[in-house]
């Protein structure tokens, strides 16, 4: 058993049929010595008396808010949560496996630049009685500070018969130099509590590996005289690290119709303009990627050919 | 503002072209190592990230773009460090800071060159003959060092008398290649910045 926060404790249980469970001793936070009784949740049934209560925690029915009273007055609470371990593996029931970039990916993180700011998100099908708390650091043995905000519900989607909820959090490394060469990864830890179930999820990464620039901005077309070719120009996104001559981007320019299966014109360039062949009912799209360290491409910025 | 495009122009800035070749060669070699040594811990997640130049050179700080010198976090290890315009120590007189930056890059390359050559000598003794260093990568390191045109003491190649542990050598190769790739990215950024200045 360990303390998650004041008056909230996590009991780690090996979860299998007829498991013996864990013996837990609760102590009432009071100077009083006698006349103390214990109850669980909303029940008025007295579980025991005395300053301490010893219980055998085996299942979710044994978890919950234990309260010690004296003469009708509440003295203190202890909330017990369960953390299940099945076949030596901690449960991951609360969050959905996003399977990208690999299986068992519950947290996904992205950064728009090298400033040390990043966003992580996760998915769940649970809509109520759910809380998250996020901590982060650079390195684990001698951790350096990363400050994270509160996790918020950022999107709701319908997936077949189910509703899916996306939560996200923004974090900022306390003293980040955009030009630094990372040797220790960022660690992100998410505590998830659903009713009386506790789970924790972690992710470890270098900012350089989670870079995904915003799409290029200000796409403009200039038809070339006596030609089917069009000159397309754009600018670096505002959120990208500066100076741009140091943090350079490379671009992919594509002309394609509505369907992915349609024919296309595609060209890669380090410049902020390119010449492509425009077709009726097609769109010109441009996306960006760090020129020197191949992490993710940005989303496309698009303009219609016409 | 519209930034100048970094196109290789050997006359104006020979180092840009060489640094692009360097990053390409290191990336290819790292990819080859990851494929060949698939049953070894050779991915970014599996290895320890060591920097053999730590406390010996200060490339990131010495080559910091002027615009980042206002960032306190970038200056924690040096008072002032920034580069100004100039070419790859070619004909124009370069500033002191710029020379410091380029000489730091040169020292990085020299250290990695010695490490890689020592390692290759060991790998050539491996009866499995599983992996060797790409000669093109070693040549590209050499070309960039020549383009930087510094004279410094020759670092003797390390020779060891004990029987090499090939497993450890291959893991060390992965560690070195990962670190060198990150440094090659920094070098490429620096050269691109200098070329645009």
């Amino acid at each position: 058993i360990w303390e998650l926060k004041k008056d909230v404790y996590v009991v780690e249980l090996d979860w299998y049929p007829d498991a013996p469970g864990e013996m837990v001793v609760l102590t009432c936070d009071t100077p009083e010595e006698d006349g103390i009784t214990w109850t669980l949740d909303q029940s008025s049934e007295v579980l025991g008396s005395g300053k301490t209560l010893t219980i055998q925690v085996k299942e979710f029915g044994d978890a919950g808010q234990y309260t010690c009273h004296k003469g009708g007055e509440v003295l203190s609470h202890s909330l017990l949560l369960l953390h299940k371990k099945e076949d030596g593996i901690w449960s991951t029931d609360i969050l959905k496996d996003q399977k990208e970039p690999k299986n068992k990916t519950f947290l996904r993180c992205e950064a728009k630049n090298y400033s040390g700011r990043f966003t992580c998100w996760w998915l769940t099908t649970i809509s109520t009685d759910l809380t998250f708390s996020v901590k982060s650091s650079r390195g684990s043995s001698d951790p350096q500070g990363v400050t994270c905000g509160a996790a918020t519900l950022s999107a709701e989607r319908v997936r077949g018969d189910n509703k899916e909820y996306e939560y996200s959090v923004e974090c900022q490394e306390d003293s980040a130099c955009p030009a630094a060469e990372e040797s220790l990864p960022i660690e992100v830890m998410v505590d998830a509590v659903h009713k009386l179930k506790y789970e924790n999820y972690t992710s470890s990464f270098f900012i350089r590996d989670i870079i995904k620039p915003d799409p290029p901005k200000n796409l403009q077309l200039k038809p070339l005289k006596n030609s089917r070719q069009v000159e397309v120009s754009w600018e670096y996104p505002d959120t990208w690290s500066t100076p741009h001559s140091y943090f350079s981007l490379t671009f992919c320019v594509q002309v394609q119709g509505k369907s992915k299966r349609e024919k296309k014109d595609r060209v890669f360039t380090d410049k902020t303009s390119a010449t492509v062949i425009c077709r009726k009912n097609a769109s010109i799209s441009v996306r960006a990627q760090d020129r020197y360290y191949s992490s993710s491409w940005s989303e496309w910025a698009s303009v219609p050919c016409s | 503002r519209n930034l100048p495009v970094a196109t290789p122009d050997p006359g104006m800035f020979p180092c840009l072209h060489h640094s692009q070749n360097l990053l390409r060669a290191v990336s290819n070699m790292l990819q080859k190592a990851r494929q060949t040594l698939e049953f070894y811990p050779c991915t970014s997640e599996e290895i320890d990230h060591e920097d053999i130049t730590k406390d010996k050179t200060s490339t990131v700080e010495a080559c910091l773009p002027l615009e980042l010198t206002k960032n306190e976090s970038c200056l924690n290890s040096r008072e002032t460090s920034f580069i100004t315009n100039g070419s790859c120590l070619a004909s124009r007189k370069t500033s002191f800071m710029m020379a410091l930056c380029l000489s730091s890059i040169y020292e990085d390359l020299k250290m990695y060159q010695v490490e890689f050559k020592t390692m290759n000598a060991k790998l050539l003794m491996d009866p499995k003959r599983q992996i060797f260093l790409d000669q093109n990568m070693l040549a590209v390191i050499d070309e960039l060092m020549q383009a930087l045109n510094f004279n410094s003491e020759t670092v003797p190649q390390k020779s060891s008398l004990e029987e090499p542990d090939f497993y450890k050598t291959k893991i060390k190769l992965c560690i070195l290649l990962h670190a060198f790739r990150i440094r090659a990215v920094t070098i490429d950024r620096v050269m691109s910045y200098l070329n645009a200045s």
Epitope: R228, Q229, T250, R261, E262, K263, K264, D265, R266, V267, F268, T269, D270, T275, I277, R279, K280 | V5, T7, P8
Partner: antibody, heavy 118, light 107 residues
């Protein structure tokens, strides 16, 4: 299986014209760009131009501009390349090639040898 | 027009040995570079597109690298069926242009 089948070899006199055909099978004809590339005996490859069979748009290499015409007939899934004012240096194998991507070629015809000789 | 220069023009190689062919562009072309193989009396065949992207059905011993002006086609271990002429082609701008070809022959 996508295939491009070209017309047979031709022998032409200098100053005349030649029209080579390229019939496509497998896949929808208008879903691909179609190019013509030639190769003189013992020489390298030389791009001549492309057509978008969907709308008839064409683009030619400046070297052949005014002498080459590329057309396409959607009803027969056939593309044509006509080269006029032939000279001896036009002796070459002429290939048609296609792709959903405009700028490179993933399927090639077997080639048509055009000999220009007096 | 962008001029593509291949080297060497002829490459004698022992079967089983690796081979590398270089292609240089007269100006920066990013990764807009493709490689073809052509055997005598046959049409060209696409091997690699956009400098390093492999084609399904092409043996994994063929790989491409490079960007900007310098590109390389590598055959890790030459098989008897690999003796052919190899061409690079740029797609950065029209007109599309090819290298002059590199003939890989048995040593």
């Amino acid at each position: 299986q996508v295939q491009l089948v070209q017309s047979g070899a031709e022998v032409k006199k200098p100053g005349s014209s030649v029209k080579v055909s390229c019939k496509a099978s497998g896949g929808t004809f208008s879903d691909y760009y179609l190019h013509w590339v030639r190769q003189a005996p013992g020489q390298g490859l030389e791009w001549m131009g492309w057509i978008d069979p969907e709308n008839g748009d064409t683009e030619y290499a400046p070297k052949f501009q005014g002498r080459v015409t590329i057309t396409a007939d959607e009803s027969t899934s056939t593309a044509y390349m006509e080269l006029s004012s032939l000279r001896s240096e036009d002796t070459a194998v002429y290939y048609c090639a296609r792709n959903k991507e405009l700028r490179y070629f993933d399927v090639w015809g077997q080639g048509t040898l055009v000999t220009v000789s007096s | 027009d962008i001029v593509m220069t291949q080297s060497p023009l002829s490459l004698p190689v022992t079967p089983g040995e690796p081979a590398s062919i270089s292609c240089r562009a007269s100006q920066s072309i990013s990764i807009n570079l493709h490689w073809y193989q052509q055997k005598p009396g046959q049409q060209p065949r696409l091997l690699i597109y956009f400098a390093s992207q492999s084609i399904s059905g092409v043996p994994s011993r063929f790989s491409g690298s490079g960007s900007g002006t310098d590109f390389t086609l590598t055959i890790s271990s030459l098989q008897p069926e690999d003796f052919a002429t190899y061409y690079c082609q740029q797609s950065n701008s029209f007109p599309l242009t090819f290298g002059q070809g590199t003939k890989v022959e048995i040593k």
